[in-house]
């Protein structure tokens, strides 16, 4: 049931639930936005990012896209709707528990994405092989 | 209406565990609809937010009381429940369990009466 | 986490007076504000929510209004049962954090 001030003051179409009939509650995500970052050659990273911070939308995931160019290394940490793309790419991953790192085509770049859709999921990046979702492990969690 | 009842000691020693139970009526702990959460007011200052906990078992604890925090529930008795572990003076509070509509994620919308813990030997 | 500073501590008015209270975040806090009322020996009582609406059987006289780090809540008409400590409380940022409260006395 939705409380009567929530009935009027929210629209319809703001109302988020998942496939049990359930309410989806806002999510919280590290968001910095982009940040220097020292992540390189390691298989996972610690985002580094201060601000959790709660989505707009109940349907936003976190994502995280990790840069190298010639002069420096960003980790940017933000909510966003993965319906829409983001730097163009679409989130793929996002039902995901864990924010798995994917190499995407970027010229002059380096350029990494993953999203997930668990508390603070992106504040920890994982770049390692053993997590991609060739394993059927992960496989399951994500799609249980 | 939902309607929410703290319960457990009112005194409680330096070092020992706080322990209290939120008892809820007029709707159910495992609805989607809502979460649930604990905060405590120490005598004549402000309120502070310890953590909370949505239906799908995801909780969320204040940072600076995170290693010392377990928010738990009983879906068969309707009720959760709070221990914090280590106790000092300054834990000493008004401590309210309360509930808010889940899309308004932080909002609280249903408070109990709230109970007196002191932290003494 | 973002600190929340309320003014002015105290609001000395009569009934029938409007009251401003002011409420103003150390950081945007995007319109993720909300505003409580507490009563001595009583628990709070959400007045407003994301800076604007009125919670279930709250009167017309309270209104909320700003957004990013300057937020007021406005009592149109003080009534007798409107003196009490007003907390402000934002959910941007987590943990939620809250003001340090005003109170609204009688002058």
């Known amino acids: 049931t939705i409380p009567p001030h929530v009935q009027k003051s929210v629209n319809n179409d703001m109302i988020v639930t998942d496939n049990n009939g359930a309410v989806k509650f806002p999510q919280l995500c590290k968001f910095c936005d982009v940040r220097f970052s020292t992540c390189d050659n390691q298989k996972s990273c610690m985002s580094n990012c201060s601000i959790t911070s709660i989505c707009e939308k109940p349907q936003e995931v976190c994502v995280a896209v990790w840069r190298k160019n010639d002069e420096n290394i960003t980790l940017e940490t933000v909510c966003h709707d993965p319906k829409l793309p983001y730097h163009d790419f679409i989130l793929e991953d996002a039902a995901s528990p864990k924010c798995i790192m994917k190499e995407k085509k970027k010229p002059g770049e380096t350029f990494f994405m993953c999203s997930c859709s668990s508390d603070e999921c992106n504040d920890n990046i994982i770049f390692s092989e053993e997590y991609n979702t060739s394993n059927p492990d992960l496989l399951l969690v994500i799609f249980q | 209406q939902l309607q929410l009842q703290e319960s457990g000691p009112g005194l409680v020693k330096p070092s020992e565990t706080l322990s209290l139970t939120c008892t809820v009526s007029?709707?159910?702990?495992?609805?989607?609809?809502?979460?649930w959460g604990w905060i405590r007011q120490p005598p004549g200052k402000g309120l502070e937010w310890i953590g909370s906990?949505?239906?799908?078992?995801?909780?969320y604890y204040s940072p600076s009381l995170k290693s010392r925090i377990i928010i738990s529930e009983d879906t068969s008795k309707n009720q959760f429940s709070l221990k914090l572990s280590s106790v000092t003076a300054a834990d000493t509070a008004v401590y309210y369990c309360?509930?808010?509509?889940?899309?308004?994620?932080?909002?609280?919308?249903?408070w109990g009466q709230g109970t007196l813990v002191t932290v003494s030997s | 986490e973002i600190v929340l500073t309320q003014s002015p501590a105290t609001l000395s008015l009569s009934p029938g007076e409007r009251a401003t209270l002011s409420c103003r975040a150390s950081?945007?806090?995007?319109?993720?504000l909300a505003w409580y009322q507490q009563k001595p020996g009583q628990a709070p009582r959400l007045l407003i929510y994301d800076a604007s609406n009125r919670a279930t059987g709250i009167p017309a006289r309270f209104s909320g209004s700003g957004s990013g780090t300057d937020f007021t809540l406005t009592i149109s008409s003080l009534e007798p049962e409107d003196f009490a400590v007003y907390y402000c409380?934002?959910?941007?940022?987590?943990?939620?954090?809250f003001g340090q409260g005003t109170k609204v006395e009688i002058k």
């Open positions: 409380q934002q959910r941007s940022n987590w943990p939620p954090t």
């Open positions: 007029g709707g159910s702990i495992s609805s989607s609809s809502y979460s």
């Open positions: 906990f949505y239906y799908s078992g995801i909780t």
């Open positions: 309360a509930s808010g509509f889940t899309m308004i994620r932080g909002a609280l919308d249903y």
């Open positions: 950081q945007s806090v995007r319109s993720f």
